[in-house]
Interface confidence: low
């Protein structure tokens, strides 16, 4: 007869190993019993576990309650054992030997190697701000045995670097993702993907990008010049610009104090029905967390009794 | 145990509003962004929204800008999608996230409804 076994038996850290041996004898064979036992190389063998046809099954008291046998029904030929929650310092290598009549003695090896799944995080770099160089986005690390993939997932443009460090019974990879930081990043998703042979998928963490910018500001209202003119109602002035955070937006005159009766709505300037008292220089000041930016006019309210054109000065300053 | 509970989902018609909430239980800290994705039938899971930890950052889908607002208070550990003149277009099945940025978890809600019709 002969033993069958498998070379290495692979169990994810926690669940139950099956530790194949099956005596595949002659008819008339019979098993006698079947001893287990934990043979690393440079130490003594120590026994796991002994299963006798009369006597039953016996484990060390350092495995107690976590040999079994498989459920039945059993073949009186089949020695394999079960090893409940399997941890890191299982993995090794292990021995059975199978003792039958008439044939004599058996012994077989097999190794078993214990996966242990990664947990990663992910950790967002400093805040990313428009006009920053190349700037960590995200870091993210798994340590599991064998050492985990770290990879990213993302639309957006940027750079990666990997370092391993490698632990007794593990190894820690930890991937950094840079980037240039743009406004057209905001909202996007960087996806950290973490590959391991202990999981039945990929494990994926997603962080959302926020880069804080503020754009040009730009004053909109006097195109047509011809429009401001004395007694025009719903003359208005609108501040253009965006960021993130959203801006705030603050007018003010340049050469004096707002006229009475002129209007401030957030980027809206309203005048009531035009006088020259309005002409003047305006200023848009739009500002947030992150940034501020000016942007002036000046009105020159057109008198209808004078043939005189108009003129419109655009400014923008950060 | 991290728990994300959305509501706030129903029937509305066209040019309606609806204010969706997110309560999460279970975390202790409000150092995470959150997000509000939906998923119409037969496409894929969008991002509509995200805010940052503070509420300080917010983000928006073209397709909602103007029309949507998300806020969060973290005193209370919830999260709030504001959806006013609503399309039909905007029905879906909207899930809160939270991007556990300390610990690299990920939390999804079970999703709220929203449907859009006259």
């Known amino acids: 007869g002969e033993l069958e076994t498998s070379d290495v038996v692979t169990v994810v850290l926690g669940q139950d190993a099956k530790l194949p041996c099956f005596y595949r004898g002659d008819s008339g064979e019979q098993v006698g019993q079947v001893a287990w036992a934990r043979v690393d190389a440079g130490e003594g063998a120590q026994e796991l576990a002994l299963l006798h046809s009369k006597y039953g099954l016996h484990v060390s008291p350092a495995y107690e309650g976590r040999v079994e046998q498989p459920p039945p029904p059993r073949n009186p030929l089949d020695g394999s054992v079960l090893l409940r929650n399997a941890v890191q310092a299982d993995e090794g290598e292990y021995e059975c030997r199978v003792s039958t009549f008439p044939a004599g003695s058996f012994q077989a090896r097999l190794r078993l190697r214990v996966l242990v799944p990664p947990l990663p995080s992910l950790n967002p770099g400093p805040a990313l701000e428009e006009g920053q160089g190349l700037t960590l986005a995200a870091s993210c690390t798994a340590e599991g045995s064998p050492a985990p993939s770290v990879t990213w997932d993302t639309e957006v443009k940027g750079t990666t670097s990997s370092r391993s460090f490698k632990h007794s019974r593990s190894a820690a990879v930890t991937s950094e993702f840079h980037l240039v930081p743009s406004r057209s990043m905001n909202g996007q998703p960087l996806t950290c993907v973490v590959s391991h042979p202990g999981l039945l998928q990929d494990q994926r963490i997603t962080h959302i990008l926020h880069v804080s910018f503020l754009a040009e500001a730009s004053v909109r209202g006097l195109e047509d010049q011809n429009l401001w003119h004395i007694g025009r109602e719903g003359a208005m002035l609108k501040c253009l610009s965006e960021g993130q955070p959203p801006p705030s937006y603050n007018w003010t005159r340049l050469d004096g104090p707002l006229p009475s009766g002129v209007r401030v709505d957030g980027d809206t300037l309203g005048f009531p029905p035009l006088t020259t008292e309005h002409s003047g220089i305006y200023v848009c000041h739009v500002s947030n967390e992150f940034s501020s930016r000016d942007s002036q006019v000046t009105v020159d309210v057109l008198d209808p009794q004078e043939d005189s054109g108009k003129q419109v000065d655009l400014v923008s300053a950060s | 145990e991290v728990q994300l509970l959305e509501s706030g989902g129903g029937l509305v018609q066209p040019g309606g509003s609806l204010r969706l909430s997110c309560a999460a239980s279970?975390?202790?800290?409000?150092?995470?962004?959150m997000g509000w994705y939906r998923q119409a039938p037969g496409k894929e899971r969008e991002l509509v929204s995200s805010i940052s930890s503070s509420g300080g950052l917010t983000h928006y889908a073209d397709s909602v800008k103007g029309r949507f607002t998300i806020s969060r208070d973290n005193s209370k550990n919830t999260l709030y999608l504001q959806m006013n003149s609503l399309k039909p277009e905007d029905t879906a099945v909207y899930y809160c996230?939270?991007?556990?940025?300390?610990?690299?978890?990920?939390?999804w809600g079970q999703g709220t409804q929203v449907t859009v019709s006259s």
């Open positions: 996230d939270a991007d556990i940025a300390y610990t690299g978890a990920d939390y």
């Open positions: 279970g975390l202790t800290s409000s150092g995470y962004a």
